[in-house]
Interface confidence: low
Amino acid sequence: IIPVEEENPDFWNRQAAEALGAAKKLQPIQTAAKNLIIFLGDGMGVSTVTAARILKGQKEEKLGPETPLAMDHFPYVALSKTYSVDKHVPDSAATATAYLCGVKGNFQTIGLSAAARYNQCNTTRGNEVVSVMNRAKKAGKSVGVVTTTRVQHASPAGAYAHTVNRNWYSDANMPGSARREGCKDIATQLISNMDIDVILGGGRKYMFRMGAPDPEYPHDYSQDGTRMDGKNLVQEWLAKHQGARYVWNRTELMQASLDPSVTHLMGLFEPGDMKYEIHRDPTLDPSLMEMTEAALRLLSRNPRGFFLFVEGGRIDHGHHESRAYRALTEAVMFDDAIERAGQLTSEEDTLTLVTADHSHVFSFGAYPLRGSSIFGLAPGKAQDRKAYTALLYGNGPGYVLKDGARPDVTESESGSPEYRQQAAVPLDEETHAGEDVAVFARGPQAHLVHGVQEQSFVAHVMAFAACLEPYTACDLAPPAGTTD
Amino acid sequence: IIPVEEENPDFWNRQAAEALGAAKKLQPIQTAAKNLIIFLGDGMGVSTVTAARILKGQKEEKLGPETPLAMDHFPYVALSKTYSVDKHVPDSAATATAYLCGVKGNFQTIGLSAAARYNQCNTTRGNEVVSVMNRAKKAGKSVGVVTTTRVQHASPAGAYAHTVNRNWYSDANMPGSARREGCKDIATQLISNMDIDVILGGGRKYMFRMGAPDPEYPHDYSQDGTRMDGKNLVQEWLAKHQGARYVWNRTELMQASLDPSVTHLMGLFEPGDMKYEIHRDPTLDPSLMEMTEAALRLLSRNPRGFFLFVEGGRIDHGHHESRAYRALTEAVMFDDAIERAGQLTSEEDTLTLVTADHSHVFSFGAYPLRGSSIFGLAPGKAQDRKAYTALLYGNGPGYVLKDGARPDVTESESGSPEYRQQAAVPLDEETHAGEDVAVFARGPQAHLVHGVQEQSFVAHVMAFAACLEPYTACDLAPPAGTTD
C-alpha cells in the first residue's frame, strides 16, 4: 500500500519542518521534579518498540509505522548500556539494581553491588545498595510499585530488596542454609525493608502459609500459599498502617482507589504473574493501565510528591516463549499505561522515564509491504521453498524440525496468539539480548537524558532531578506549583 | 571476569556523577554550521553498534562493553524510523532518499519521491528530490562522497542521483527501453548531475567502456569496464575542471590529497565494491579512515565550508552474508573514521551526524561472560545438546542442516572470519530489519536531534543547521570563526 498523500514531497517536507519547529522550541525544564515515574518495559528492546508501534498503529486502523506510540512523544532519548558486571548480556535482576539503585551488580542478584555473589547468602551483608524509591520515601514522598509480574519479581524487587538470588520469592524457594544464615526471602523484604504506599501486581502465593487456599482458585493446589514459616505477610503488612487495604480483584481495586481513607494499598491479583493481557478476565483482573491509574490516584495526594515504578513485565515472558504475539500485545498495553499516566500528570513537575532493562534476540525483517500484519509472512519463499515470517528469533523454543526439515507456516498460523516464531537455535527459553536499549524522558531535568550512558545513570538522573541522596545539594529551583 | 574496581558502588556512583556533571554542562551550539558531515553505517542497527563496541574494546585489551566508541561520545541521540513509503522494512535506496534528500521514497528507488515507481523509467521526470549535498554545492560549499562500496551504490547515489532502479550502475545494467526513454545510469549521473569535489570509493568498472582492462586486474576480464556507450566517464569528468585528478590506489591518493593544485579528486580503488577491511591490501587500497582524512583535507580548504558523506557501506554486506565477523570489523573501521574526523574538525563549526539507513536481523544473545569474545560460544548447550554462538541471525545463508539436524560449532570455528552464524530461516541473503536506528549528533544545531523522528528529518536538520534550502532564512548566527 502506498498512501497517496505520501507520494508528494510536500508531505515529508512539511512534516519535517514541523518537527524542526518543535525541536527549536524545546526548552529544558530546569526546576526540580516533584514526582518521579519510571516505566520499565521488561525485555523491550528497540525491535520490540518498533514492532509494537506498528501493531498499535494497525489496531487504530492505520498502516502502522507512521503512528507514534505514547513513548515516541517523549522529547529526549538516550541509549543505555545494559551489561552486568559479570555478563555481556544481563538478566532483569542485575539490570534492576542498575536503573533503580544506580550501581551495576551481578547476574541474578538484586539490590547488591557486584561484591555480592549469586546464591551465596553470606555475601549479602555490607553490599546492599539503596534504591531511589527508598531515598524518595526517606525524603517524605509517597512511593509505589506496579507490575504485571509477581511483585516479588526481579524488576520490582530492585526497588526494595537485597538478595543474592532473584528466585527467593518466598522462604520455600530458599535453601535451609540461607535461611539459617539470616537471608530473607523477597516477599518478606517487600513488607519489612521499607514503607511502600502502593503495591500492585501478582504474587499472592508467596505471601501466605503453605497450603493456604487461593481466594480465586481455591481448588487448585498449585496456586496455594507457599510459605514454610506459616506467616501471613499480608496480615502483617495491614497491621503496620491504619489506612492499609488489601485487594485481590479489579472491583476491590477500583473501590479502594476512590476511598480517601485508604493510605496504603496492596493489590495482588494472581497467585503468580498476572495473566497476559490477551488472557485477562476484565471482570476479575485490572489492566496495567488501570493499576497505573489507581496508583497515581493514591500517590498524588502527597504534597511532597511521589516515586512510582510501573513495569510491563510480561513483554519479556512473551519473548522468552518465542511468542511475539504475547510480547507485542503486552508492549502495546504498556504504552497505553504510559499514555494514561501522561494524562494524569504534568510534565512541569513530573519526570517520567520509559526504558527497558534489556532486549531480546527478536527481529523484524524480510521486506514486508507497508500495512501488512506485523505477524504476517514475508513476501516470497525461503531457500527451502517454504514460507517464513517477518518476525523471527535468534534462539528459543520456536526452533522445530519436522521430519528433519524446517516446518512451513501459513498466514493464519503465524497470526495465532499461540504461534511461536521460528528460531536459529533450540533453547527451552529464548534469551535476552545485549544491545543498548532506549531511554525516553520527559519533564524536569529530562534533558540530562542524552547520548550513550551506562544503565546505572538512569537512577542518578531520577535522584538528581528530585534532589534525593546523594544530590540533596542539587541547586535546582523547587518544582512548579510548590512553595518551599 | 568481574573487574574488582566495579565491585565497589563508588565506581558506579562516581562515574554517574561525572556523567551528570557533563550532562548539566551541555550547552547547545546555537550558531549555524559551516560544515556538514554525515557518517552512514549501512545496516548498522543498535545491535551492531553494541557488538562493535565490545569488539573494539576487546581489540584495545579491555573487557569490551564499558569502552566507548567514538560515536558514543556524541552528546545527542535520536531514534530514526526507517520504513519506506511502500515497505515496513526498507532498503538502502529508499532510505538514502530520506536521510539525504529529506523525503521518503519507495523501495529500490533513489532521489525520487514515492510518486515514482520501481523500474518504470517514465515515472522519473518531475519526481526528483534534491539532496542536501546538491543544495550545499549551490550555496558555494565544497562537497564530497566517500564510501567502501561502489560510489554508484544506493547510499552514496542518494546524494547526487535520481533513478527508479538502484541497480542501474552503468548503461549495461539498464534495459534498452529505459535508455531510449532518456533515463541515465548512475555512473553517468555521478559526473553530470552536479559538481562533486571529492569522490572516493569503489566502482571503476562502471566508468569505462566495455572490455577496457582494469589497471589493477588487467588479466581478469570480469573486472573490465562495462559501459556499452563506449564512454570514458573518468576522462569526461577530468575535462570539466582544470584541477581535477583521478587516482586508483592508495599511494596516488596520498599524493593527491597533499597537492594544493588538486581541486577535484576522484579515487576509485576497486572495479566494484572495495575489499572488506580484513582483506584489504594496505599498500594498494586506502582504509575508510584514510579516505575520510584525504576528503577532509581537500574539502576544508573552502572558506564557505563543506558537505561530506562518509559511508561504512560493507557492514551491511557482512550481515547479508551472515558473517558477523565481517560486519563488525567493518563497523569498527567505520568508528575509527568517525574518530579521525573528530580530530580533524571542530564541533564549534561542524555538525557531524552518525546514523544507519536500516538495521539487520542480527542479535547478540545468550548470557556470555563479561570479557568473552563477541564471536564466542554461549555458555551451556542448546536443547539438542550442541553448542551455539551468542551472535545469531533471524534469517540468511547461515541456516544449515547436517544429516537433518543443526550442526554443532566450536569456539575456533565461530571465531573464523569466514564463519556464518546460524539463522532460523534459510535465505540466499540475510535481510534488513525494520526497527528504529540511532542518530548520533555533535556540533551546531545537534540538539535538534532528539526524540523519535522520521528518517527524513535527518536531511532537514542538516539543511537547517547550514541555512541551506529551504531554510535559508534560518535566523542563525554565522558559524564560529567566520565573518559574514
Epitope: N167, S222, H320, S322, Y399, D428 | Q383
Partner: nanobody
Framework: QVQLVESGGGLVQPGGSLRLSCAAS????????MGWYRQAPGKQRDLVAV???????HYADSVKGRFTISRDNAKNTVYLQMNSLKPEDTAVYYC???????????????WGQGTKVTVSS
C-alpha cells in the same frame, strides 16, 4: 521440588522391545525438555533421545530408527519405545528434565533414579 519417576525397565531378548516411561511431578514450567540418557557399566552417561515441549526431537545416531521418544505434555510424561534391542543397549536408563532458569525458580537439570535395561539371550 521436582521428582522424576521412571518405569518399564527389565530383561529382554535381543530383537525384543521395551517401553520406558518417566513422569515428572512438582512445579514444572511449560517450556522444557524431557529426555533419556543411558549409562552402560564402566562407561559415561550418554544421550539417547530428547523431546522438547515445542516438538523438536533429537536422537543419538546409535538408536535412530529403532527407538522412538514421545511425550504427553498434559501429563508431564515422556516415553521411550525401544525396538530391535541389541546387547549393546544394556544400560541404566535415566530420565532427564531441563527447565529454564529464567522465569522460574529452581535448578536447570533434574534426573530420575534410573531404570535397568538388560538385553541378553
Amino acid at each position: 521440588q521436582v521428582q522424576l519417576v521412571e518405569s518399564g525397565g527389565g530383561l529382554v531378548q535381543p530383537g525384543g522391545s521395551l517401553r520406558l516411561s518417566c513422569a515428572a511431578s512438582g512445579s514444572i514450567f511449560s517450556v522444557n525438555t524431557m529426555g533419556w540418557y543411558r549409562q552402560a557399566p564402566g562407561k559415561q552417561r550418554d544421550l539417547v533421545a530428547v523431546a522438547t515441549s515445542g516438538g523438536t526431537i533429537h536422537y543419538a545416531d546409535s538408536v535412530k530408527g529403532r527407538f522412538t521418544i514421545s511425550r504427553d505434555n498434559a501429563k508431564n510424561t515422556v516415553y521411550l519405545q525401544m525396538n530391535s534391542l541389541k546387547p549393546e543397549d544394556t544400560a541404566v536408563y535415566y530420565c532427564n528434565l531441563v527447565v529454564p532458569y529464567g522465569m522460574i525458580a529452581g535448578d536447570h537439570d533434574y534426573w530420575g533414579q534410573g531404570t535397568k535395561v538388560t538385553v541378553s539371550s
